[in-house]
């Protein structure tokens, strides 16, 4: 997977009046990395691993960037003409990626009340607008404003692309993101299903990077995909991921089943607990 930096900013309006402040989150390699603390008006790292990325450096630069972006987005929202009464939101998501072959991608997406209405490839400067008439109207509105704004020139988009990549490279240089391997905690639970059956669930949590194999085995042989149910691999808010896999088995056959986990070149197998209450949890 490519390395990525993703900025997610949201500004709000009430009855046509743009609210002060903004919401901002930054994700590094899909993990919550920074958020803007509105009380302290500062960018704050999300968890210890995020702090480790910058070491003892301050977060002034990040604070400055997010504040500037928030101000720009508030101005953009103020120029959206179709604001009716009530609460409305304008969200900007900007993503840049560095792929294994060192190629890069950058894009920017605008959402009004949660609906995508404008996207731009920051490298080619191509704009894309969804087909709906509402999206077309909003996109024209915002593009006209962006053209009027002297800051939003050709060089500005190049700068947005370059700045995002520069920040991403700076974070990667710390080595924390690249080197980091956090092994999963694996636990197996059982619950009653239909008569004569139980559902066994294997959960892996607090692991990094995201790639993991988690599967049920019967007598040491992997069960087919159609007999297992998988959860998505999701961030758990601590700079790590979590996922699960479940299957239904006959009561009394528990000893035949194990959960197999493989992560970052390591593996483990985990039996089904024999009692109803017992949960086997292990950190390999």
């Amino acid at each position: 997977e490519p390395h990525s930096l993703r900025y997610n900013l949201t500004v709000l309006s009430w009855d046509g009046s743009v609210q002060s402040g903004f919401l901002a989150e930054v994700h590094l390699d899909g993990q919550p990395f920074l958020r803007y603390d509105r009380q302290k008006c500062r960018a704050k790292p999300q968890g210890q691993w995020a702090e480790d990325v910058l070491g003892n450096k301050t977060w002034d630069r990040e604070t400055r960037d997010l504040t500037g972006n928030g101000k720009d987005l508030r101005m953009t929202l103020a120029h959206i003409k179709d604001q009716k009464e009530g609460l409305h939101s304008l969200q900007e998501i900007r993503v840049c990626e560095i792929h294994e072959d060192n190629s890069t991608r950058s894009s920017q997406h605008f959402y009004y009340d949660g609906e995508l209405f404008l996207s731009q490839n920051l490298e080619t400067e191509e704009w894309t607008v969804p087909q709906s008439s509402r999206a077309q109207t909003l996109a024209m509105n915002v593009r006209n404003f962006l053209k009027e704004d002297a800051m939003k020139t050709k060089t500005h988009y190049h700068a947005m692309h370059a700045d995002c990549l520069q920040e991403l490279r700076r974070y990667l240089e710390s080595g924390v993101v690249l080197r980091r391997t956090v092994p999963p905690m694996v636990n197996v639970t059982r619950s009653e299903a239909s008569e004569g059956n139980i559902t066994v669930t294997c959960r892996a949590s607090s692991f990094y990077p995201r790639n993991i194999i988690l599967t049920w085995r019967q007598d040491g042989v992997s069960l087919s995909h159609d007999t297992q149910q998988w959860g998505d691999v999701l961030p758990d808010g601590n700079g790590t991921y979590q996922t699960w896999v479940a299957t239904r088995i006959c009561r009394g056959e528990e000893q035949r089943f194990t959960c197999y986990m493989e992560h970052s070149g390591n593996h483990s197998t985990h039996p089904v607990p024999s009692g109803k209450v017992l949960v086997l949890q292990s950190h390999w």
Partner: antibody, heavy 118, light 107 residues
Framework: QVQLVQSGAEVKKPGASVKVSCKAS????????FYWVRQAPGQGLEWIGY????????VYNQKFKGKATLTVDKSTSTAYMELRSLRSDDTAVYYC???????????WGQGTLVTVSS | DIQMTQSPSSLSASVGDRVTITCRAS??????LNWYQQTPGKAVKLLIY???RLHSGVPSRFSGSGSGTDYTLTISSLQPEDIATYFC?????????FGQGTKLEIK
Amino acid sequence: QVQLVQSGAEVKKPGASVKVSCKASGYAFTKYNFYWVRQAPGQGLEWIGYIDPYFGGTVYNQKFKGKATLTVDKSTSTAYMELRSLRSDDTAVYYCATTDAYSLFTYWGQGTLVTVSS
Amino acid sequence: DIQMTQSPSSLSASVGDRVTITCRASQDISNYLNWYQQTPGKAVKLLIYYTSRLHSGVPSRFSGSGSGTDYTLTISSLQPEDIATYFCLQGNTLPFTFGQGTKLEIK
């Protein structure tokens, strides 16, 4: 490639015990189960039991409970099967086998002949 | 225990012949059936798993079919190196049980 090398032939007296070894190479030892099977002279194959080498969990054929004990030594990538209270009808070739997680008994050892005779 | 009845117990065929060996289970084994080849002085080899899946490196002249209680191993064109004993294994229900074997000879 996956290789299972078993210990040499054994001759034992009735009532004695024997420990057959199965040394694995060519893959990560704790990844896959070990299965044990026997074939008495002129007879078919009989499954004895299996062991998960990661945590040592075992499942036995009821017929061999109390007769066979399966263990592993992770440090030497070796699986063991101990047979106790040997009788003449335990005379057989004993095989270890492992899997690739797609099928049971994917790879087999060459077999170990255990002869029980007074 | 599930009984696996394999037939024939021995058979003689010529090079190039199509050879069929069958295994019948005493109850439904849901396709959890493997076929193996045992040659004197060599390790046992897996040929087919889950009724019809060819194990890697096994020649395509070997194939498997069946469902429920009845399963078949077919060698489409017998080769001299196929002379061996063949047996089936059911892996659906514990204890795992094997067929008695079919000894294949060249005419």
